[in-house]
Interface confidence: low
C-alpha cells in the first residue's frame, strides 16, 4: 500500500542479499512513456545511496552501462554489514530547476552465513513442564535467520520448533511445548539446532540428554514451621514437593545476618526438624530441591517464610549502677540504674524489671517491679544495704544481678591517681588512671561514669557507666559523647565493701568559647575588690573551660591591661583582686579559656575603689 | 538517525478514552513519505497490528478495534494518532507506532507507550 515505483523498476544482480566484500550491479528502468520530455536524450537516470535514511553517496561516477533515457545500470562495491537503501532519481537536463524526481529503490542487504549453533542447554521447569532449550548462535548475520529446533528420542518421538533472528529480534531459545514424563527416566533425548538464511547454512552437533539432566524440580511451596512446646530454639519447617524429589537443601538465617545456615536433608518428605535456633529472632527459611541424589539440578531456592521463633526466659547478667545522695541525718536517696538486655539475651520482650533493696543485717527487703531501667527510694542512712534486679519476659525471669551499697567516693585510699581524659576523636574520649597507692582491701573492679556538665544533668539525666576490670587501668568512652560539651568523668575503685573515687573534666572536641563570662558586681571590702560574674551559657562553653581570665586597666589608658588567671570551678562565681589604685576609675571584663583557646571579652564595667590601696 | 516516540498513554477506566501521538524527528525526508501504524503488544502474548494509514491515505483496523479507534496523520508535524474510545481491560498492553519507508520495506520502531484499562 505505498504509492511508489510508478516511474519505472530498479532490479539488483545478483541478488538484493550478499555476502560481505561482494559487487552487485543495479540497474535502474524508465516504464514506458516515463520521462521528462518526448525527448529520450534529456532522461537522466542517477542512483543515491541512503544509510540509516542519511544521503552518503551519489553513484553518478559508478556507471557501467546507460541506454540512454531509459535504463543505467551502476555497479555498487564496499558495502557495509546491514541494509543499504539505493534510490533511483530521474534528472530532466533541459530543466535545471526542477529537483530530480524519484524513480524506484532497492535495498541491499549484507551479511554473512550462520554458524552453526553452539552451547545447546534444554531445561523443563518441574514434572508438568515444557521443554526449552537455548543455544548460542555465534556471530551477528546481518540477515534475517531462521533457527529450527529438532528433537528425537524413543518410540520414534520427534519434535521440532522455529523461530527467525533479525535487526530487531534475536532468536536463542525455543520453547518444544512437549512434556518428559518421569516414566522416561533412564531414555535418552537428541536434540539440534539448523540455522539458514539467503546466504548459507549451518546445524549444530547433536546434543544428548536424559530426564534427569534437564528437569529442573519447581521450587519448594507452602513453606511453613512449627515450633515444639512454643520452644524458641526447636522447630520442624515442613513444605510441599513435587513427588519425585529425593533431596532438599535448606538454608535459614536471622533477618539482620549476612550468612546462612546450610543443611542438605535426604527422603526428608517436606518436613524437618530444627534445634540451633535463636528466641525471639526473626528468620528468614529457603529450601531448594533435586530429583537424583547424584544426577540432575537443583530447584530455584524457594519464596521465603520469614517468622520469628518464640520468646524463652532471659539469660545474662544485668549492668546495674547506683548514685547515693544523703537527705538529712538520717536519711539516703538510692537511685540504680541498669542497662537493658542485649537482644540475645532477653530472647523476648522484656516487660518488666524485679528490682530488690534489702538491708543485709535487718533483714529489711523493699520490693517493687518497673517496665524503666531506673529505680529510686529513700532508705536510713544507717546499715549495710544489697541491691538486686532481674528482666522479666512473658516467659520466665533471668537470675538476679545483686550489688553492693557502699559510700562510693567514701575511702580516700580507694581513690585512683593520675586520672587523665585525652580526646580521641569527635565522639570519644581516652580516660586512663593509676590504681589506688595504699588500697587498704582489694579492688574488684573499676566504674567509670560520665555526665554532661549542663544545669540539670545530675537530676535529669542518667548516668553512662562502664565497668572495666580490675587489672586494666583506660577505658575508651564514646556512648552519648558529643563534640564540643564537657563532660565530668569520674573513676571509682570498688572493693567488696568500700569505694574510692576521682574525678576529672574531659571533652571530646573543643573550640574557643561563644562568649566571655557576664560580670554582675564589683564590690570593696577591706580593701579588697570583689568580682562576681554568671557562667557563660552551656552551650556557649564548647567544651571544657580550663580557666578564667579578669582584666582590667585604667579607664583611658592605652598601656596593656593586666590580667588575673583563675582555675575554673562550677561553684565558684566571685574572686578579689588587690592591686587597683584608690580612686582611679577602672574598666574591667572577664574571658573564658578552653583547650583550643580564647573566647571574646565579656561585658565591660567601670568601677573606682574608694579605699586605701595596698 | 530517524525516531519515533509515542506519547499519550496512561491509567483509564473502562468505557474511556485516550490518544495516543506518535512524532517523527531526525533526519528525516518527511512522514509523508511512510505508511504508519499502530501495533501492541500484551504481557505474554503477540504483537498485533491494531491500525494502519498508508502515505496514499488508505486506513486499516484490526476486528477487535473497528468503530472504537481511529487513526489519522499530520504530516506537516511529522505525526501520527490514535484516538481510542470506549475502551475495554483488554485493550491493556504496551501501544508501539510503526513507519514504514523505502524500497521494498525499512521498518522504524518507537518504544513503545502503555495503556492500562481498569475495570
Known amino acids: 500500500n505505498i504509492d511508489v515505483c510508478k516511474l519505472g523498476t530498479v532490479t539488483v544482480q545478483p541478488a538484493p542479499v550478499i555476502p560481505l566484500g561482494s559487487a552487485a550491479n543495479i540497474s535502474c528502468s524508465l516504464n514506458p512513456k516515463q520521462g521528462c520530455s518526448h525527448y529520450p536524450s534529456s532522461n537522466e537516470l542517477i542512483l543515491l545511496k541512503f544509510v540509516n535514511d542519511v544521503l552518503v553517496e551519489n553513484l553518478h561516477g559508478k556507471k557501467v552501462h546507460d541506454h540512454t533515457g531509459h535504463s543505467s545500470t551502476f555497479q555498487v562495491t564496499n558495502l557495509s554489514l546491514g541494509m543499504t537503501l539505493f534510490v533511483c532519481k530521474l534528472n530532466c537536463s533541459n530543466s535545471q530547476k526542477k529537483p530530480p524526481v524519484p524513480v524506484c529503490g532497492v535495498e541491499i542487504s549484507v551479511g554473512v552465513a550462520p554458524e552453526p549453533p553452539q552451547n545447546i542447554s534444554c531445561v523443563q521447569e518441574g514434572e508438568n513442564g515444557t521443554v526449552a532449550c537455548s543455544w548460542n548462535s555465534g556471530k551477528v548475520t546481518y540477515l534475517k535467520t531462521n533457527y529450527t529446533l529438532q528433537l528425537s528420542g524413543p518410540n520414534n518421538l520427534t519434535c521440532q520448533k522455529q523461530c527467525f533472528s533479525d535487526n530487531r529480534q534475536n532468536c536463542n531459545r525455543l520453547d518444544l511445548g512437549i512434556n518428559l514424563s518421569p516414566d522416561l527416566a533412564e531414555s535418552r533425548f537428541i536434540v539440534r539446532v539448523t540455522a539458514i538464511n539467503d546466504l548459507g547454512n549451518s546445524s549444530s552437533l547433536p546434543h544428548t540428554f536424559t530426564f534427569l539432566d534437564i528437569v529442573i524440580p519447581l521450587p519448594p511451596w507452602d513453606i511453613r514451621i512449627n515450633f515444639l512446646n512454643a520452644s524458641g530454639s526447636r522447630g520442624t519447617l515442613q513444605w510441599e514437593d513435587e513427588g519425585q524429589v529425593v533431596l532438599n537443601q535448606l538454608r535459614y538465617q536471622p533477618l539482620n545476618s549476612t550468612s546462612w545456615n546450610m543443611v542438605n536433608a535426604t527422603n526428608a518428605k517436606g518436613k524437618y526438624d530444627l534445634r540451633d535456633l535463636r528466641p525471639f529472632t526473626e528468620y528468614e527459611f529457603q529450601i531448594s530441591s533435586k530429583l537424583h541424589l547424584s544426577g540432575g539440578s537443583w530447584s530455584n531456592w524457594s519464596e521465603s517464610l520469614r517468622t520469628r521463633t518464640p520468646e524463652e526466659e532471659p539469660v545474662g547478667i544485668l549492668d546495674i549502677w547506683y548514685m547515693k545522695q544523703d537527705i538529712d541525718y538520717d536519711r539516703q536517696q538510692i537511685s540504680l540504674f541498669w542497662k537493658s538486655l542485649n537482644p540475645s539475651e532477653a530472647r523476648g520482650k522484656i516487660l518488666h524489671y524485679q528490682v530488690t533493696l534489702q538491708e543485709v543485717t535487718k533483714k529489711t527487703t523493699l520490693q517493687n517491679t518497673t517496665r524503666h531501667t531506673s529505680w529510686t527510694r529513700v532508705i536510713p542512712r544507717t546499715g549495710a544495704w544489697t541491691a538486686s534486679v532481674s528482666a522479666a519476659n512473658s516467659k520466665g525471669a533471668s537470675a538476679p544481678t545483686h550489688i553492693n551499697i557502699v559510700d562510693l567516693c567514701g575511702t580516700g585510699l580507694l581513690a585512683p591517681h593520675q586520672v587523665s581524659a585525652k580526646s580521641e576523636n569527635m565522639d570519644n574520649i581516652l580516660v586512663t588512671w593509676q590504681p589506688p597507692k595504699k588500697a587498704d582491701s582489694a579492688v574488684r573492679e573499676y566504674i567509670v561514669e560520665w555526665r554532661a556538665l549542663q544545669p540539670g544533668s545530675i537530676t535529669k539525666f542518667p548516668p553512662h557507666w562502664l565497668r572495666i576490670p580490675p587489672d586494666n587501668m583506660s577505658a575508651l568512652i564514646s556512648e552519648n559523647i558529643k563534640p564540643y560539651i564537657c563532660y565530668e568523668i569520674r573513676v571509682h575503685a570498688l572493693s567488696e565493701s568500700q569505694g574510692g573515687c576521682s574525678s576529672i573534666r574531659g571533652d571530646s572536641k573543643h573550640k574557643a568559647p561563644v562568649s566571655g563570662p557576664h560580670i554582675t558586681a564589683i564590690t570593696e571590702k577591706k580593701e579588697r575588690l570583689f568580682i562576681s560574674w554568671t557562667h557563660i551559657p552551656f552551650p556557649e562553653q564548647r567544651g571544657c573551660i580550663l580557666h578564667y581570665r579578669i582584666y582590667w586597666k585604667e579607664r583611658d589608658s592605652t598601656a596593656q591591661p593586666e590580667l588575673c588567671e583563675i582555675q575554673y570551678r562550677r561553684s565558684q562565681n566571685s574572686h578579689p583582686i588587690s592591686s587597683l589604685q584608690p580612686r582611679v576609675t577602672y574598666v574591667l571584663w572577664m574571658t573564658a579559656v578552653t583547650a583550643a583557646g580564647e573566647s571574646p571579652q565579656g561585658n565591660e564595667r567601670e568601677f573606682c575603689p574608694q579605699g586605701k590601696a595596698n | 538517525q530517524v525516531q519515533l516516540q509515542e506519547s499519550g498513554g496512561g491509567l483509564v477506566q473502562a468505557g474511556g478514552s485516550l490518544r495516543l501521538s506518535c512524532a517523527a524527528s531526525?533526519?528525516?525526508?518527511?512522514?509523508?513519505?511512510?505508511?504508519m501504524a499502530w501495533y501492541r503488544q500484551a504481557p505474554g502474548k503477540q504483537r498485533e497490528l491494531v491500525a494502519s494509514i498508508s502515505n496514499s491515505g488508505s486506513i486499516g483496523y484490526a476486528d477487535s478495534v473497528k468503530g472504537r479507534f481511529t487513526i489519522s496523520r499530520d504530516n506537516g508535524k511529522n505525526s501520527v494518532y490514535l484516538q481510542m474510545n470506549s475502551l475495554k481491560p483488554e485493550d491493556t498492553a504496551v501501544y508501539l507506532c510503526n513507519g514504514r519507508t523505502g524500497w521494498p520495506r525499512y521498518d522504524l520502531w518507537g518504544q513503545g507507550t502503555q495503556v492500562t484499562v481498569s475495570s
Open positions: 531526525g533526519s528525516i525526508r518527511s512522514i509523508n513519505a511512510m505508511a
